[in-house]
């Protein structure tokens, strides 16, 4: 048993039929010694008397809010949650496996730049009695601070008759050094509580591996005289790290016909302009990627070849 927060405790249980469970001793937080009784949740049934209560926790019926009283007055509470371990593996019932980029991916994270700010999100089919708490650090043995906000419901996703709820959280490394080579990964830990079930989920990554720039901005076309060619120009996205001479992007320029089946012409460049042939009814799209590290490409910015 361990304390999750004040007056909230997690009991770790091996979960199999006829498991013996865990013996837990609860102590009433009071200077009183005599006339103390214990109840569970809203029941008025007295479970025991005295300053301590010893219980055998085997199943969810044994979890809940234990309250000690004296003469009709509440003295203190202890909320017991269960963390299930089946065949040596902690349960992952609360969150949905996103299966991207690999199986058993419960948390996904992205950063738009090297500032130390990143966003993580997760999915669940559970709509009520659900709370999340997020902690993060760089490294685990001598952790450096990362501050995370509160997890919020960012989207509800409906697929047929099924609903999924997407939660997201924004975190910021306290003393980020954008230009430094990362040697220790960021660790993100999410505590999830559904009713009386506790689970925890973790993700470990380097910021450089979760970078996804915003699309290039101010994409413009300038026709070249007496030619079917156009000069395409664009700018670095506002959210990208500066100076751009150090935090450089590379770009992919694509000419795409109206139909997705049409052949695409692609040009790769480190500059913020390129010359391409504009076909009728085609569009020109540009996306960006870190020039020196192969993390994700941005989404496309597009303009029509009109």
């Amino acid at each position: 048993i361990w304390e999750l927060k004040k007056d909230v405790y997690v009991v770790e249980l091996d979960w199999y039929p006829d498991a013996p469970g865990e013996m837990v001793v609860l102590t009433c937080d009071t200077p009183e010694e005599d006339g103390i009784t214990w109840t569970l949740d809203q029941s008025s049934e007295v479970l025991g008397s005295g300053k301590t209560l010893t219980i055998q926790v085997k199943e969810f019926g044994d979890a809940g809010q234990y309250t000690c009283h004296k003469g009709g007055e509440v003295l203190s509470h202890s909320l017991l949650l269960l963390h299930k371990k089946e065949d040596g593996i902690w349960s992952t019932d609360i969150l949905k496996d996103q299966k991207e980029p690999k199986n058993k991916t419960f948390l996904r994270c992205e950063a738009k730049n090297y500032s130390g700010r990143f966003t993580c999100w997760w999915l669940t089919t559970i709509s009520t009695d659900l709370t999340f708490s997020v902690k993060s650090s760089r490294g685990s043995s001598d952790p450096q601070g990362v501050t995370c906000g509160a997890a919020t419901l960012s989207a509800e996703r409906v697929r047929g008759d099924n609903k999924e709820y997407e939660y997201s959280v924004e975190c910021q490394e306290d003393s980020a050094c954008p230009a430094a080579e990362e040697s220790l990964p960021i660790e993100v830990m999410v505590d999830a509580v559904h009713k009386l079930k506790y689970e925890n989920y973790t993700s470990s990554f380097f910021i450089r591996d979760i970078i996804k720039p915003d699309p290039p901005k101010n994409l413009q076309l300038k026709p070249l005289k007496n030619s079917r060619q156009v000069e395409v120009s664009w700018e670095y996205p506002d959210t990208w790290s500066t100076p751009h001479s150090y935090f450089s992007l590379t770009f992919c320029v694509q000419v795409q016909g109206k139909s997705k089946r049409e052949k695409k012409d692609r040009v790769f460049t480190d500059k913020t302009s390129a010359t391409v042939i504009c076909r009728k009814n085609a569009s020109i799209s540009v996306r960006a990627q870190d020039r020196y590290y192969s993390s994700s490409w941005s989404e496309w910015a597009s303009v029509p070849c009109s």
Epitope: E110, T119, W121, V158, S259, K260, S298, E299
Partner: nanobody, 126 residues
């Protein structure tokens, strides 16, 4: 040429309803996820709702959950946003935007888009 033309905005009292439409042309509408985003006075762009190319998956922001419903008619090349129980906080210019692909983008990418319309003003006031 890709064109997205929104309509259906206007002045509505708190608690009222509006239905926004977005007529799309110049591309294969049924191949792309579509979204609604909005910009309130003095605020940044806020993602509202998205729908996959075949309507099998819809996403709606937590802030409008239970009040706004996105839908599309691929035969008519039209995207819709049904807005019920409107609040003064919903006052904004609403834009129809084309996503990058047939699926809804990740949370960090939802206010990014390939193309967007000129927008339609929604004002919620008594």
């Amino acid at each position: 040429e890709v064109q997205l033309v929104e309509s259906g905005g206007g002045l509505v009292p708190p608690g009222g309803s509006l239905r926004l439409s977005c007529a799309a042309s110049g591309f294969t509408f049924s191949s792309y996820a579509m979204s609604w985003v909005r910009r309130a006075p003095g605020r940044g762009l806020e993602w509202i709702s998205s729908i996959s190319s075949g309507s099998d998956t819809t996403h709606v922001a937590g802030s409008v959950r239970g009040r706004f419903t996105i839908s599309r008619d691929n035969a008519k090349n039209t995207l819709y946003l049904q807005m019920n129980s409107l609040k003064p906080d919903d006052t904004a210019v609403y834009y129809c935007v084309r996503a990058y692909d047939s699926i809804v983008p990740s949370p960090t990418q939802r206010t990014n888009y390939e193309y967007r319309g000129q927008g339609t003003q929604v004002t919620v006031s008594s």
